[in-house]
Amino acid sequence: SIPWNLERIIPAWQQTEEDSSPDGSSQVEVYLLDTSIQSGHREIEGRVTITDFNSVPEEDGTRFHRQASKCDSHGTHLAGVVSGRDAGVAKGTSLHSLRVLNCQGKGTVSGTLIGLEFIRKSQLIQPSGPLVVLLPLAGGYSRILNTACQRLARTGVVLVAAAGNFRDDACLYSPASAPEVITVGATNAQDQPVTLGTLGTNFGRCVDLFAPGKDIIGASSDCSTCYMSQSGTSQAAAHVAGIVAMMLNRDPALTLAELRQRLILFSTKDVINMAWFPEDQRVLTPNRVATLPPSTQETGGQLLCRTVWSAHSGPTRTATATARCAPEEELLSCSSFSRSGRRRGDRIEAIGGQQVCKALNAFGGEGVYAVARCCLLPRVNCSIHNTPAARAGPQTPVHCHQKDHVLTGCSFHWEVENLRAQQQPLLRSRHQPGQCVGHQEASVHASCCHAPGLECKIKEHGIAGPAEQVTVACEAGWTLTGCNVLPGASLPLGAYSVDNVCVARIRDAGRADRTSEEATVAAAICCRSRPSAKASWVHQ
Amino acid sequence: QDEDGDYEELMLALPSQEDSLVDEASHVATATFRRCSKEAWRLPGTYVVVLMEETQRLQVEQTAHRLQTWAARRGYVIKVLHVFYDLFPGFLVKMSSDLLGLALKLPHVEYIEEDSLVFAQ
């Protein structure tokens, strides 16, 4: 007798007495930037502080009637979803409410900025335990709102935002598009994207994961014991804010990067029907629904990686796309993808002291994406080994020559467009284990890393027949760090990682008479961290 | 996620004869003006003036005061609604859009963003 949304994110087998106890103490504090709330509701009574913060625009219309219960509706429901004693996710968590949305649910970027600054000031005046900020609101893309979120995140605050309800690319909205924010889309009881009238949940590369957001039962401001159902990405974000509060309550030392990686790792994968999303967004949208991760005591020390997509480069000949990891994360590999196949490859380069993944468009190309594999590994130290394009002669292997360094990724690019050249093999574990192999016209970049107990291996899967994509997955206990396409007779569109699966995409020429030598191969570099062991390359 | 979304970024410059009115404003604006791509969500008349990251607290207040002074000389009244410092240096100002060109020429200004609406989701 537990509502579907709570069962979905905290499966019964994983619930502990501590997690489900509404009277348990929590050192985590959640700040909610929303409408006013009814703090006397049975769900949240005694665990909500209404701050004196109020920065809202006037309501529209001369005849607008401020009815308290309507003014409080959105915020009360969300406060209940986060920490409600019965319908809440993190039942013991204390919550602070800041009013940045008026009775019509409208606010301003400036009001939100002042609210974020208020939180920062509170943090400076009275430092406390871990802080989570829930932003169940969205406006158009705002550089300054994203910057404020970034600065607050740098102080150790975890920000969770609604992806938006516009059935659109979340990257066009703020704070959803801020990289430092955990951005949440909404799914229903069938794990499908939420439709809201003619619109629905936002999607795309700026969404980190999805969470329940349809027909969510929670506190109603109509009366102090009333409940109602509401839908939206706000409700989804509130679930994730609750999960984050529970994670921090178990392990207050978790950083934003670790929280995000663990949310991604332990989410339920591949349950969303991606056909709901526009075709060009499907590859960019994460197919994962949030669940409460187990505690770090049970799963500590493993290599955690996620895929970060860049914005689309645009179609100009010299266009580039750049994907960045979070400051704490290490860029272990870089690949690229183009729907037309016209690209000049990818490389890792340093910009402002940070390694970034760069993809290069080619003449006649419609644009490229850079795909970074961003990982968390204690005491990791990486370097890039480059081999410039040889003007003539045999293929040039690039390997990791520093002691105890292992290959985690290969990148390659051409200075000039040469689609024929792209159809040459680039990496062959059977002949040169632990090496990136380029051909005479490509610059090859090997990503070589050292960390205690880091070991890696290449895993390949080839298809000789007609195919649009080839995949290879790292087995349990191993984490995908690098992904490349080794093309056969067809033009490679590129390669990218989806969770622990390497996807090689090709434009199939439809030739069924290919020899195995011409097979298109997806090559994954799979790594694991065994802190007691020495760094090593595992020969298959 | 994103460095710049679907965004209106405009370079505004004052006519040259107006530059001579105030010596301090004589350098060409390198700062940009940004506003929401969705026109219905824009709130013209309220602007967040964002200063360079290293700008000191005192310089933020001086910059806001300088803008008020320049505006007053042109017969405009502007209201500084809030000064930001804890997350980024800048200030929120209510003023005529006529003054944007002038504001973009202020020292330390990185960009100016027009205020816009956000909505409960």
């Epitope: 509502p3 489900s20 019965d86 319908a87 039942k91 109509d222 014991t225 | -």
Partner: antibody, heavy 123, light 107 residues
Framework: EVQLQQSGPELVKPGASVKISCKAS????????MNWVKQSHGKSLEWIGD????????SYNQKFKGKATLTVDKSSSTAYMELRSLTSEDSAVYYC????????????????WGQGTTLTVSS | DIQMTQTTSSLSASLGDRVTISCSAS??????LNWYQQKPDGTVKLLIY???SLHSGVPSRFSGSGSGTDYSLTISNLEPEDIATYYC?????????FGSGTKLEIK
């Protein structure tokens, strides 16, 4: 048939504590909040508080905080109310009453009542 | 706390009469009001919830109405088994509060 069977009458001395029980049958125990209501002799009803049997979450009337503690034992479908530091003011009939659980969100009433437990505090 | 007032503490009526019991709240309670019946032996039953909704198994001669702060319970055709004390109860704000009760007797 739904039944809430309360424990029998209690005669206790001032300063002592007492624990009253309410055993539910005929319905799924976790589908209803368990409320407790006090009725002093010849007086009206006073709501003491409620408990959600799913997770033990409680709400109390401020007046009874520190006086009453509500608990449940899911395995036996029984709710308990402990009253401590008893005085003659606590002499009353105490009722348990089942009210609709939160996700049946139109159910803000006490559907089923126990027969009442008479508590007498006297030296 | 919201005060619930039942001004009539006792009421005498004849069998077959139409009886109205009133209840007022110290502030608006938006129809979040229930009515209960307590028989002389102490048994308590729910009659009406949310101002006017009849609880299952309750005879249709019972009805409720009201809004804002003023509410009433009506028994259209008084029967012998209706002899009891009737309480109103609000659930607009915690704590739940009850009226002082109206005792209904037969003339």
């Amino acid at each position: 048939e739904v039944q809430l069977q309360q424990s029998g009458p209690e005669l206790v001395k001032p300063g002592a504590s007492v624990k009253i029980s309410c055993k539910a049958s005929g319905y799924t125990f976790t589908d209803y909040y368990m409320n407790w209501v006090k009725q002093s002799h010849g007086k009206s009803l006073e709501w003491i508080g409620d408990i959600n049997p799913n997770n033990g979450g409680t709400s109390y009337n401020q007046k009874f905080k520190g006086k009453a503690t509500l608990t449940v034992d899911k395995s036996s479908s029984t709710a308990y109310m402990e009253l401590r530091s008893l005085t003659s003011e606590d002499s009353a009939v105490y009722y348990c009453a089942g009210g609709g659980i939160y996700y049946r969100y139109d159910r803000n009433y006490f559907d089923y009542w126990g027969q009442g437990t008479t508590l007498t505090v006297s030296s | 706390d919201i005060q619930m007032t039942q001004t009539t503490s006792s009421l005498s009526a004849s069998l077959g009469d139409r009886v109205t019991i009133s209840c007022s709240a110290s502030q608006g309670i938006s129809n979040y009001l229930n009515w209960y019946q307590q028989k002389p032996d102490g048994t308590v039953k729910l009659l009406i919830y949310y101002t006017s909704s009849l609880h299952s198994g309750v005879p249709s001669r019972f009805s409720g109405s009201g809004s804002g702060t003023d509410y009433s319970l009506t028994i259209s055709n008084l029967e012998p088994e209706d002899i009891a004390t009737y309480y109103c109860q609000q659930y607009s704000k915690l704590p739940f509060t009850f009226g002082s009760g109206t005792k209904l007797e037969i003339k």
